[in-house]
Interface confidence: low
């Protein structure tokens, strides 16, 4: 594989990076953009042809402690008549996010970053049909 | 801060809240098997509200590559494969936490950052406003 040519510029080494023990990283959990708000269309979880419900999971040893998960309400999709059409499928849409896990080992505490898969909502798809010979 | 249950047998010096700055192990525990939404499913093509995935790369962030969904149509795809404008394709957005290098370019010093990503699209019945 060839590296694309992007000139000869290099990042400058920062003058002062915090000293970090080997195998660790320093993490400031004061969140940048903490007050940012989602501006999704209103009630899309109910108006969708693949509607979903929300469940809040709570874990006091996780930061953030609250993670919201979506679950599709139906296997099929809702048609124009408001009935479930099982020739189509409601499927979950997922996204990874990071959380900080606090672990107690005896009286000492350690922190671990964790990737968590969040189900964000659902979408209606045409099913993949496998024909058996 | 977040309140943490304390082991009753431990000294009282332990803070009940998450401290502002923590040292974390470099190994990120992955509870998931699929990591690339582009590879993990073809829902973006099979959906009645299909979307395209756009690559957003930032070397100062972890993960450095995030895929952003953009709905292909204003309407939704009907049974005949045509766009039905009586329905709307809308993005599903999610706040996620990422790591931002702080100070910039430092290899092992980060701050949590909340970013808003469009993960996919869903087909909804429009809200119709009737004018009196």
């Amino acid at each position: 594989r060839k590296i694309p040519k992007v000139g000869h510029t290099f990042f400058q080494k920062p003058e002062s990076c915090p000293p970090v023990p080997g195998g660790s990283m320093k993490l400031d959990i004061g969140i940048i953009n903490e007050n940012q708000r989602v501006s999704m269309s209103r009630n899309i979880e109910s108006r969708s042809t693949s509607p979903w419900n929300y469940t809040v999971t709570w874990d006091p040893n996780r930061y953030p402690s609250e993670v919201v998960q979506a679950q599709c309400r139906n296997l099929g999709c809702i048609n124009a008549q408001g009935k479930e059409d099982i020739s189509m499928n409601s499927v979950p849409i997922q996204q990874e996010t990071l959380v900080v896990r606090r672990k107690h080992q005896g009286c000492s505490v350690s922190f671990q970053l964790e990737k968590v898969l969040v189900t964000v909502g659902c979408t209606c798809v045409t099913p993949v049909i496998h024909h058996v010979q | 801060g977040i309140t943490i249950p304390r082991n009753p047998g431990c000294p009282n010096s332990e803070d009940k809240n998450f401290p502002r700055t923590v040292m974390v192990n470099l190994n990120i525990h992955n509870r998931n098997t699929n990591t690339n939404p582009k590879r993990s499913s073809d829902y973006y093509n099979r959906s009645t509200s299909p979307w395209n995935l756009h690559r957003n790369e930032d070397p100062e962030r972890y993960p450095s590559v995030i895929w952003e969904a953009k709905c292909r149509h204003l309407g939704c795809i009907n049974a005949d494969g045509n766009v039905d404008y009586h329905m709307n394709s809308v993005p599903i957005q999610q706040e996620i936490l990422v790591l931002r290098r702080e100070p910039p370019h430092c290899p092992n010093s980060f701050r949590l950052e909340k970013i808003l990503v469009s993960v996919g699209c869903t087909c909804v019945t429009p809200i119709v406003h009737h004018v009196a």
Partner: nanobody, 125 residues
Framework: EVQLVESGGGVVQPGGSLRLSCADS????????MGWFRQAPGKEREFVAA????????YYADSVKGRFAISRDTARNTVYLQMNSLKPEDTAVYYC??????????????????WGQGTQVTVSS
């Protein structure tokens, strides 16, 4: 202070071989892509080879392809550059660099911020 230490340079005849090592004693860059670069007298620093954090993705400059091989030993926190069929034009100070994108992928040559002190390689008859 983050430290990358190169070793293995020296004087070698054309057609000879050398193996350079880059030690990351503090384990600062286990999750970063690493690269080898070189700088000949009076010239700009140029990209030679790079390897992803996992070691399964490698990139080479056209001028060294087929002659040089980059590898990493994660247990020893060391990155190697095996240089075979050396030519006089390979003479330079060789630097090891760490890429600053945390997820360990190799992509561009312009975001390496951490460097070793360099090791001299001279190819001469």
């Amino acid at each position: 202070e983050v430290q990358l230490v190169e070793s293995g340079g020296g004087v070698v005849q054309p057609g000879g071989s050398l193996r350079l090592s880059c030690a990351d004693s503090e384990r600062s860059f286990s999750f970063n892509a690493m690269g080898w670069f070189r700088q000949a007298p009076g010239k700009e620093r140029e990209f030679v080879a790079a390897i992803s954090a996992t070691g399964d993705d490698t990139y080479y400059a056209d001028s060294v392809k087929g002659r040089f091989a980059i590898s990493r030993d994660t247990a020893r926190n060391t990155v190697y550059l095996q240089m075979n069929s050396l030519k006089p034009e390979d003479t330079a100070v060789y630097y090891c660099g760490a890429r600053v994108n945390f997820d360990g992928t190799v992509s561009y040559t312009n975001d390496y911020a951490y460097w070793g002190q360099g090791t001299q390689v001279t190819v001469s008859s």
